[in-house]
């Protein structure tokens, strides 16, 4: 296939000219078939091309690699390992490529990889060592600082009989390789609970996105270690009330902003502490939008408008809210 132009415009790969050419070792800066390459922008885009494997002949200059909208299914160990290595690759986007299996060491030999997006893939089989590369109790630190895992939960009828949260957390915590992670996006994954270990062992996080999950409670989660946390997105979950322990932890974080809109807040006597805290805090930018969902008589009342006399525990709640 044709070498890339040095202009900033993308050059597409040409068809192979002859079988003799394709049999040669790949040129270091050629553009893979079905991809577009810009050496000036250090970018390769292989987008919506139904690729079934990661191209083997990626140019050594690639810094930004888009492999979105394909049919990759499996990322094997060393999926991006090349000779010479892709030493410049810093941003890798694999979203929407029908990946269901990411094996141990899939991202090994990418020394500069800072941002990885695996969103919108039904990851039924995410190896615990997908990011750490080995089963050592303490692995070499990963260079990753941003990991984007939005909507990686398989459809319900395709899920395996194990905890999806547990599988994801095992991969995030393996070998403590991701202790340098500053941004983690886990939106839209049907998470029912926030595993305690997750927050304790990712101390560098500045941005954590958990919106559009099914979190009912934060009682067992501790945010104390997240001293650098700046943004915590909890919109569109199933939160009913926040307890003093959680509120105190957030209060102790110097820079944090917490986003809580669109949760089914239960405005009964257990809500009194949260309401009092909301009225005082600067931590919740969207606090004026928070409204009661239950009991029925309180529906759509703004939390900031409530007085302690409004909050009683006489009302009968729906069964689904009592049991959680």
């Amino acid at each position: 296939s044709s070498p890339t132009s040095s202009a900033s415009s993308f050059s597409s790969s040409a068809p192979f000219l002859a079988s003799a050419v394709s049999a040669q070792p790949p040129l270091p800066d050629q553009c893979p078939a079905l991809c577009e390459c810009s050496e000036a922008a250090r970018t390769v885009k292989c987008v919506n091309r139904n690729l079934t494997e990661v191209p083997t002949d990626l140019p050594a200059y690639v810094r930004n690699l888009f492999l979105t909208g394909n049919q990759l299914a499996v990322l094997p160990a060393g999926a991006f390992a090349r000779r010479p290595p892709l030493a410049e690759l810093a941003a890798l986007n694999l979203s929407g490529s029908r990946l269901d299996e990411v094996r141990a060491g899939a991202f090994e030999h990418l020394p500069s990889l800072r941002q990885l997006d695996l969103s919108h893939n039904p990851l039924a089989d995410l190896s615990p060592f997908a990011f750490s590369g080995s089963n050592a109790s303490v692995s070499a630190p990963s260079p990753l600082v941003e990991l984007i895992l939005n909507h990686i939960v398989p459809p319900e009828d395709e899920r395996q009989n194990r905890s999806f949260e547990g599988m994801v957390v095992a991969a995030l915590l393996s070998g403590l390789a991701l202790r340098g992670l500053t941004r983690l996006e886990l939106a839209s994954n049907h998470f029912l609970f926030l595993p305690r270990d997750l927050l304790a062992q990712l101390p560098s996080l500045r941005y954590l996105d958990l919106r559009n999950n099914s979190l009912v409670s934060l009682t067992y989660a501790s945010f104390r270690n997240l001293t650098h946390l700046e943004s915590l997105h909890l919109e569109d979950n199933a939160l009913k009330v926040l307890h003093n322990s959680t509120l105190a932890e957030w209060h102790g974080l110097a820079h944090v902003k917490v986003f809580l809109d669109n949760n089914p807040w239960v405005c009964d006597c257990y809500m009194a502490d949260m309401v009092a805290w909301l009225k005082e805090t600067e931590v919740v930018p969207d606090k004026a939008r928070l409204t009661c969902a239950f009991p029925e008589k309180m529906r759509n009342r703004g939390l900031l408008d409530l007085n302690s006399s409004d909050l009683d525990c006489d009302a009968v709640l729906p069964q689904s809210l009592q049991t959680s």
């Epitope: 079934t52 049919q71 299914a73 499996v74 029908r98 990946l99 269901d100 299996e101 398989p154 395709e158």
Partner: nanobody, 122 residues
């Protein structure tokens, strides 16, 4: 082990269509990939198409792209091969296979059906 039973083969004119089915029983989801291979008289068995049970990723051999479509129905544990614009060279016994890998090699698949004959002739 996965048991595979193919159906839907038959005789069709060039340009015509057929839909093959492969019913999987036993533990079908223990195999991550389902594939169709074919073997013409006197030739080696060749890969045609594959699909993943989870996610539904698909892949095809070059000669059938745009003419054949592989799909799966997880609720029925069944995989389909919709074949259109059929040609004489598509005549073969079509085999359903199950395996773990996302590959095109015969050895990527551990469980096989008995095959169903597709004949394309005027």
């Amino acid at each position: 082990e996965v048991q595979l039973v193919e159906s839907g083969g038959g005789e069709v004119q060039p340009g015509g269509s057929l839909r093959l089915s492969c019913a999987a029983s036993g533990r079908p989801f223990s195999s991550k990939t389902m594939a169709w291979f074919r073997q013409a008289p006197g030739k080696e068995r060749e890969f045609v198409a594959a699909v993943r049970w989870i996610g539904g990723a698909t892949r095809y051999t070059e000669s059938v792209k745009g003419r054949f479509t592989i799909s799966r129905d997880n609720a029925k544990n069944t995989v389909y091969l919709q074949m259109s614009s059929l040609r004489a060279e598509d005549t073969a016994v079509y085999y359903c296979a199950a395996g773990q890998a996302w590959g095109t090699k015969f050895t990527d698949y551990s469980d096989w059906g008995q095959g169903t004959l597709v004949t394309v002739k005027p």
